[in-house]
């Protein structure tokens, strides 16, 4: 059962796993959620009745029954992990904590103009977990405006104390705001020979890389495959670090693979979600339960639904035993990974999907693309919405894209003459406009946020956000698309599609069925040549065939230019403007979304 509210002046008795320090009960709850075993926690706030050494302690707890006895205690705040909840969760913490000194290893000290600059420095430093900044009112003259970058083994402070005129906060790497290099390559036949900070068992190098990504101290890893000559090291995932953040020595070794933490690009790839099945593989660990299941998929579902289950092994039924049901072994361990991995025993193993919600929903695999044809099928573009106006009569106005459970990204020019959000309706999960009847459910619009530098589509800043009145429950037919990561600016997208219900030629009508067209991106330089009378800025992106024939058109405005990269769809562009439709040597011009990621985050994450 999902319990989100915090219990004031309440302490959970027993079940302690470990104690960490966090600046707030809210962040303690996040730490508990990301810990492999924590189900409940007790946080101690600052209070005159409490020993100051216990202030800001966050005790992570576990319980077989998923609950613990409650005891009244002033200044204690208790609660449950979000593991039991189905909603999206994130480790991103933008809060700044005033008059708190978060202790850790101070490895870098420099002058900064503001706490924001200090936080940016921390975000762009590979080792930094959190920072403390001495403001210009700090009593000691030589420490004023000093920005201390800090790290610890756990990624959380070793202690937190009250200190006047300082502020502290966390790195925003987990908010996808880092400019650090994002290197996705996995290097075959390579061992990185740097110091190990931890080791876990993993079924493949991809899982090893994901574990490294969400381990606070891991910067790169080496994985020994099941063919590795030394038997005791097979399936071993070594989590590594170095002072420079780069591997100092690489050794050519067959059957080993190495790679980097993806902490600076984590929002465009699944990190927590290990969704594959591993055949002829047994995961060993502490047994939680043994249940009958029809298939390994059913076993994975059982594991996902059991809050304490971290991984499983399914043994298929022998002949006609047990109504064709096999045995499903639900398992757990102290770190969430198998304690040993064995091959050749006939088991099928995998991980809980409970942690998938810790990844951005947008990374979830969707239906395979239908090749050929121009009409879409249901669920093919689940982020696409149709925006209707009800004045003077109801009609399709523009396209848009779901980017969060309360947010639609669209074009600013769609709202010319729209006096109020009250006349707007957002329909999601729609394939045919004819599905929309009077009783079809829709999302009302609470607020229209138009970029304040927008004047007209052709001069740029053609971007707007719609805040919905109610939240979208994600399903196969309505789910978000990932925003491009700033770290992926160098990516050259080759699989891009424009979608919408717009005209199929310049003089036409709105289409009933959602249309799609695969369109190549065009360099801004090439695009500028085609639009001599306009300024094609870096905040615009162009797409189209030289010979024309496929393009967005009237009614597609505000809809997505969706590009697939590394198996994940990204919202690369917003349909904005163009000369005619699908004309020769006149590419479509789109708002270049990567250039507005900061603006989007600022608007959608504002308190």
């Amino acid at each position: 059962e999902c319990v989100t509210q915090l219990l004031k002046d309440t302490c959970f008795e027993g079940g302690d796993i470990t104690t960490v320090f966090t600046p707030s009960a809210k962040y303690c709850q996040v730490v508990c959620t990301y810990h492999p075993r924590c189900l409940l926690f007790t946080f101690t706030a600052e209070s005159p009745s409490e020993d100051p050494t216990r202030w800001f302690t966050c005790v992570l707890k576990d319980s077989v029954t998923e609950t613990l006895p409650r005891v009244n205690r002033t200044a204690a705040i208790s609660g449950y992990s979000f593991k039991q909840c189905s909603h999206q969760i994130s480790a991103c913490n933008k809060d700044i904590y005033v008059d708190l000194d978060m202790k850790g290893i101070n490895y870098n000290s420099s002058v900064a103009k503001s706490a924001q600059e200090c936080q940016e420095r921390c975000t762009d430093d590979v080792h930094c977990h959190f920072f403390t900044y001495a403001t210009r009112q700090f009593p000691s003259l030589e420490h004023r405006n000093i920005c201390l970058l800090k790290h610890t083994q756990t990624g959380t402070p070793t202690r937190i104390t009250k200190l006047d005129k300082v502020v502290s906060g966390f790195s925003l790497k987990s908010c996808a705001l880092s400019n650090l290099a994002c290197i996705r390559d996995i290097f075959p036949n390579t061992v990185f020979a740097d110091s190990n900070i931890d080791s876990v068992m993993a079924p493949d190098a991809f899982v090893c890389g994901r574990i490294c990504t969400h381990h606070p101290g891991c910067l790169f890893f080496t994985f020994f495959s099941q063919e590795w000559p030394k038997e005791s090291q097979r399936n071993l995932c070594l989590l590594k670090t170095s002072e420079s953040g780069l591997p100092s020595t690489r050794i050519k070794k067959s059957k080993a693979l190495s790679g980097f933490s993806l902490q600076s690009c984590r929002h465009s790839i699944p990190v927590f979600c290990h969704s594959s099945f591993y055949h002829d593989t047994d995961f060993l660990g502490e047994e939680l339960d043994i249940v009958a299941a029809k298939s390994h998929e059913a076993c994975q579902k059982l594991c996902t639904n059991a809050v304490r289950c971290q991984f499983f092994t399914y043994t298929p039924a022998q002949a006609s035993c047990n109504e064709g049901k096999g045995k499903c072994y639900l398992k757990l361990s102290s770190n969430g990974s198998p304690t040993k991995i064995l091959h050749g025993r006939g088991g099928i193993s995998g991980y809980t999907l409970r942690l998938c919600k810790m990844d951005n929903e947008c990374t979830t695999k969707i239906k395979p693309r239908i090749v050929g044809g121009t009409a879409s099928v249901r669920g093919e573009w689940p982020w696409q919405v149709t925006l209707h106006t009800t004045s003077p009569t109801q009609r399709h106005l523009c396209g848009g894209s779901i980017i969060g459970n309360q947010w639609i990204l669209t074009a600013a020019h769609c709202f010319y003459g729209v006096e109020s959000p009250k006349i707007l309706r957002v329909y999601s999960g729609i394939l045919n406009q004819s599905e929309i009847k009077e009783d079809t459910s829709f999302f009302g619009v609470q607020e229209i946020i138009i970029h304040d530098q927008y004047k007209m589509a052709e001069s740029g800043y053609d971007i707007a956000l719609l805040k919905l009145e109610t939240t979208v429950n994600y399903t196969d037919s309505q789910r978000p698309i990932c925003l491009p990561s700033k770290g992926d600016r160098n990516v050259i997208y080759t699989d891009c599609w424009v979608t919408g219900w717009g005209y199929r030629k310049l003089r036409d009508k709105i289409q009933n069925t959602l249309q799609k067209a695969k369109i190549p991106l065009v360099t801004n330089e090439e695009c500028q040549k085609r639009y001599r009378g306009h300024k094609i800025t870096h905040k615009m992106i162009c797409a189209g065939y030289r010979e024309g024939g496929k393009d967005a058109c009237k009614g597609d405005s505000g809809g997505p230019l969706s590009c697939k990269h590394n198996e994940v769809w990204h919202l690369v562009g917003i349909t904005s403007w163009g000369e005619g439709c699908a004309q020769r040597e006149r590419p479509g011009v789109y708002t270049n979304v990567v250039e507005y990621v900061d603006w989007i985050l600022e608007k959608t994450q504002a308190v």
Epitope: D124, V126, L180, R184, F187, S244, R250
Partner: nanobody
């Protein structure tokens, strides 16, 4: 000690090409970030392209994407910048830089070793 030596600059007509080279000595360029930066008179130094030499991952500024290509030859300890379809606004002093740590690859303040620079002039 670490030394970076740029070469290959010169004058060229708009639309032309140049290939800049950066030879590194005093350290092995096999697991570093190497970057090309440029500075036009009266302007700030800006990142153009960078490469992680341990795996050839590349990073480009939007203004040069699709026109410039950064590459490496580990055997020669050299990084190259292939510049095609040059424009007058590409005119600047081009510097090679190296950082033997994990960094934001197009930020000049993150690099600790710098070359003397090579001039590129593009006339219309």
């Amino acid at each position: 000690q670490v030394q970076l030596q740029e070469s290959g600059g010169g004058s060229v007509q708009a639309g032309g090409s140049l290939r800049l080279s950066c030879a590194a000595s005093g350290f092995t360029a096999s697991s570093n970030f190497m970057g090309w930066f440029r500075q036009a008179p009266g302007k700030e130094r800006e990142g153009v392209a960078a490469i992680y030499t341990g795996g050839a991952s590349t990073f480009y500024a939007d203004s040069v994407k699709g026109r410039f290509t950064i590459s490496q030859d580990n055997a020669k300890n050299t990084v190259y910048l292939e510049m095609d379809t040059l424009k007058p606004e590409d005119t600047a002093m081009y510097y090679c830089a190296a950082a033997p740590r994990w960094i934001a690859p197009l930020r000049a303040d993150r690099y600790e070793y710098w070359g003397q620079g090579t001039q590129v002039t593009v006339s219309s």
